[in-house]
């Protein structure tokens, strides 16, 4: 009810002899901070006095401490929230009722806690999981309900007396809820461990012995078995007898039924610990072992391999590949049953004993196409010789071999001509399927093997052809030696080297990229008037009439081929030059007259120089002069001077006249 | 060395003639190398060359067509100088105007009159 | 008349930088081609005559070249003074015609 004073701490505390006690504690008082404070040791009420009596162990009030046995009690509390306690070094006559008797201003309270002290140090307590299994991890716990901060102690786990590997966690509280040390171990049982001994043990913090406590371990397990057999190599031969004996060597909980297994499949009817064989054959040779079951799972015996000897079966061949590139290697396997392994083999090609051969595998390093044909073996033990079986075909694959391109026209063969070619071979394995034709073009295939070049071309130089299975072979290029009228006819200037000009001497060179026959012809023509017929056309002084269009012929004994027209040009300086006058040479004073300077000239004049009567040059570069108003001083004769990039042409004089107008004449 | 003069008024009414004179010293009007220009120059028309005389055996003139009909430049021996005449003015002809020789280039030019027609 | 064509009208650089403008002419006027540049309240002054030659007392950071229809002007390494409108003029025949100019600003 809301009349109590609220305190939390463990009901009660254990300890022994000589350890000590750490009391964790908290409270809240009805009103204020506490006052006074006694612990008391078993109190007891007395009604007379309305106060309490028994041993003080420890006093606090507001005038001071009582000294009492406050060394060995110890109150570490506050006034309002914590009332932890310690008793240090603890006694057997500690046991019983600890009283804690507090007062605040206007309140008191009682509170009770146990004490249960032994005489030596009690034990630790192991916990186990209700059922522990073979190789299933398991948590061992050794829990003490006994922790005190200044008795330090530690709890160690051992195995038939010897310390455990397995590292353990130990953990500690000390809180109002618990106080307890606990440590824990994960631990992997074998079946051996079944029935073995495991101790939680006490110690001081120096490792001295304090106290244990023991468990027995139970370790549920599938049955561990051995077998026997006889003959103790389990080799024999057909015909003769094998015993095999399964024996438990351990087993919990007990063994419920037994069964024997070969290859790891069940064996009928053989449900005892005893497996008799009679008259074995071959088939019966293989892996043997027993299974013995409980309700943990069935537990199998190590296997016995059992060996029934016989003399080797028919042989067969596996060849390593097949077909077989020519050039590759290849490896034969003769695959013969026996027991023991054969020790000798004889191998046959197409029937004929192949010498030297002794081994199980033949290897061919480079396979030729003569290695073709059946291989056979037989095989050999100490129990006899197997007999031959229907062996093997070995395909050997090879390109086409000796490929010929063939011409099939006659000779010489002209540009524009149609040409046939066919390609040959020897033999081939597989056959062939489809021909290659080296250069590619756009060609008819009339037939395999056959091509047919329509319009030859000038350039179609070499033609090569392959045969192909699932390789090709191809074979030496064919020259086609197309002959054609001459090529790429240019005219190519030689001399000069630079621009012609009017007076130099001039070389033109008629070139030719190519001509089959080799033998040719020149022509050389201007607006089509027959020049010469030398390579060269020469000009010892060129003039201005020479310019025109060229062209050039070459011809051989298929055709001829004219050049482009190539366009001579002459560079002069300006010449005929003449001033002419508009609107005539002859003026009235006012009107304007224009002087044009006319002129022949390549290249064309850049800029003109007016001259007049005087030779005095007029502030004009134009081809045009133009007077305006003109007047009656400007009469006299004028000339012009024209200037290209060869040189200067000047004209001869040429006379304005200009005359008074009606108006001056009037005036006079 | 060669220096031009300019002299003239700064305003003339428009239809009015525009009368400017260029003093040369340094050469003479007469030489026979060079040429005499006028040039003018507004915001409207950037630099517009007008006109020019000059002396070979004779005296030449040589006029810009968009002022060839009211155009007139003389040569004075006797003063060393020579003279610009623009009839009927209108404000279009508002400008800066330049005299300038000609030899190999405009190599001299006056210090220019700034023309408002108004 | 023949017409000439400056370009750019306007120009930014700075100072040490180098400059270039061009003059196309409508029809070939051979080497005849001069240069002016003018500073605002000035009469223009010449600098190149006849194309690529530099008029005397010019410096030779100024540079010109082309023939026919085709002309370029250069500063080498613009300096403070050289900010100002740059004109081309063809004396090849009469009209005489400029450029309509190009102004050379400060960056």
């Known amino acids: 009810d809301s009349s109590k004073w609220v305190f939390e701490h463990p009901e009660t505390l254990y300890a022994w002899e000589g350890a000590c006690v750490w009391i964790p504690c908290t409270y809240r008082a009805l009103d204020g901070d506490l006052e006074s404070f006694i612990l008391f040791h078993n109190p007891e009420y007395n009604k007379n006095t309305s106060k309490f009596d028994g041993t003080r162990l420890y006093e606090s009030t507001k005038d001071g401490k009582v000294p009492s046995e406050q060394k060995r009690v110890q109150f570490l509390g506050d006034k309002n929230k914590n009332c932890t306690l310690s008793i240090h070094p603890v006694h057997l006559n500690d046991s019983g009722q600890l009283g804690l008797r507090m007062e605040s201003k206007t309140e008191k309270w009682m509170e009770r806690i146990h004490l249960n002290v032994s005489e030596r140090p009690f034990p630790p307590h192991i916990q186990l999981p209700p059922e522990i299994q073979e190789s299933q991890e398991v948590t061992l716990t050794c829990l003490l309900n006994f922790s005190c901060y200044g008795y330090p102690i530690q709890l160690q786990w051992l195995l038939e007396g010897v310390p455990m590997r397995q590292a353990a966690v130990t953990s500690t509280s000390l809180t109002i809820k618990s106080v307890f040390t606990r440590s824990e171990l994960k631990f992997s049982p074998q079946w051996s461990h079944h029935g073995k001994i495991v101790t939680c043990q006490l110690q001081d913090a120096d490792g001295k012995f304090l106290s244990n406590d023991t468990v027995q371990l139970n370790v549920k397990h599938t049955p561990k078995l051995e077998i026997k057999v006889t003959p103790s190599d389990a080799i024999v031969r057909e015909g003769d007898s094998v015993t095999m004996t399964c024996e438990v060597s351990s087993s919990n909980p007990e063994y419920t039924t037994v069964s024997w297994l070969k290859d790891g499949t069940s064996l009928k009817k053989q449900n005892t610990f005893t497996l008799n064989l009679r008259e074995v054959t071959k088939d019966q040779s293989g892996k043997y072992c027993c299974q013995v079951s409980n309700d943990v799972g069935p537990g199998r015996s190590e296997e016995v391999f059992l060996q029934v000897q016989y003399a080797p079966e028919p042989s067969t061949v596996q060849i390593l590949h097949s077909p077989a590139v020519e050039g590759s290697q290849v490896e034969f396997l003769c695959m013969s049953l026996a027991n023991p392994l054969p020790t000798n083999y004889t191998w046959y090609h197409n029937g004929k004993e192949m010498q030297g051969r002794t081994e199980e595998k033949v290897h061919i390093p480079k396979i030729l196409p003569w290695h073709a044909g059946t291989y056979s073996c037989v095989a050999e033990n100490i129990l006899g010789t197997g007999q031959r079986g229907p062996g093997a075909e070995l395909d050997v694959q090879y390109p086409p071999k000796k490929v010929t391109t063939v011409i099939q026209n006659p000779m010489p063969i002209r540009e524009g001509d149609t040409v046939t070619l066919s390609c040959n071979y020897n033999s081939s394995n597989p056959s062939v399927t489809r021909y290659e034709w080296k250069p590619h073009g756009a060609w008819e295939e009339p037939s395999l093997g056959v091509l047919k070049i329509q319009n030859v071309g000038w350039d179609n130089t070499t033609i090569a052809c392959a045969a192909c299975n699932s390789w090709c072979s191809w074979a030496s290029p064919v020259a086609l030696n197309v002959q054609y009228a001459p090529r790429d006819v240019r005219v190519r200037k030689i001399k000069p080297l630079s621009e012609i000009h009017s007076g130099n001497s001039v070389s033109l060179q008629c070139d030719f990229s190519s001509s089959h026959p080799k033998e040719v012809q020149f022509f050389w023509e201007k607006n089509g008037r027959l020049l010469g017929k030398e390579s060269q056309l020469n000009f010892d002084s060129i003039s201005p009439e020479d310019a025109g269009s060229y062209s050039c012929w070459v011809n051989n004994s298929i055709g001829q081929t004219a050049s482009k027209a190539w366009t001579l040009e002459v560079l002069y300086a300006p010449r005929r030059l003449r001033v002419s006058m508009s609107p005539g040479d002859q003026v009235m004073e006012g009107k304007s007259a224009t002087l044009t300077c006319e002129s022949d000239a390549n290249p064309p004049v850049s800029h003109y120089t007016w001259f007049d009567w005087n030779n005095q040059s007029l502030p004009y570069h134009s081809q045009k002069l133009r007077l305006e108003p003109v007047k009656v001083q400007h009469s006299g004769a004028y000339w012009c001077q024209g200037t290209n990039s060869v040189g200067k042409g000047r004209s001869p004089l040429s006379t304005l006249t200009v005359y008074y107008s009606p108006e001056t004449i009037g005036r006079r | 060395q060669v220096q031009l003069q300019q002299s003239g008024p700064g305003l003339v009414e428009p239809s009015q003639t525009l009368s400017l004179t260029c003093a040369i010293s340094?050469?003479?009007?007469?030489?026979?190398?060079?040429?005499w220009n006028w040039i003018r120059q507004s915001p409207s028309r950037g630099l517009e060359w007008l006109g020019r005389t000059y002396y070979r055996s004779t005296w030449y003139n040589d006029y810009a067509g968009s002022v060839k009909s009211r155009i007139t430049i003389n040569p004075d021996t006797s003063k060393n100088q020579f003279s610009l005449q623009l009839n009927s003015v209108t404000p279009e002809d508002t400008a800066v105007y330049y005299c300038?020789?000609?030899?190999?280039?405009?190599?001299?030019w006056g210090q220019g009159t700034m023309v408002t027609v108004s | 008349d023949i017409v000439m064509t400056q370009s750019p009208s306007s120009l930014s650089a700075s100072v040490g930088d180098r400059v270039t403008i061009t003059c196309r002419a409508s029809?070939?006027?051979?080497?005849?081609l001069n240069w002016y540049q003018q500073k605002p309240g000035k009469a223009p002054k010449l600098l190149i005559y006849?194309?690529?030659n530099l008029e005397t007392g010019v410096p030779s950071r100024f540079s010109g070249s082309g023939s026919g229809t085709d002309f370029t002007f250069t500063i080498t390494s613009l300096q403070p003074e050289d900010f100002a409108t740059y004109y081309c003029?063809?004396?090849?025949?009469?009209?005489?015609?400029f450029g309509g100019g190009t102004k050379v600003e400060i960056k």
């Open positions: 029809q070939s006027i051979s080497s005849y």
């Open positions: 003029q063809q004396s090849y025949t009469t009209p005489l015609t």
């Open positions: 006849d194309a690529s």
């Open positions: 340094g050469d003479s009007v007469s030489s026979d190398s060079v040429a």
């Open positions: 300038a020789r000609d030899r190999n280039g405009m190599d001299v």
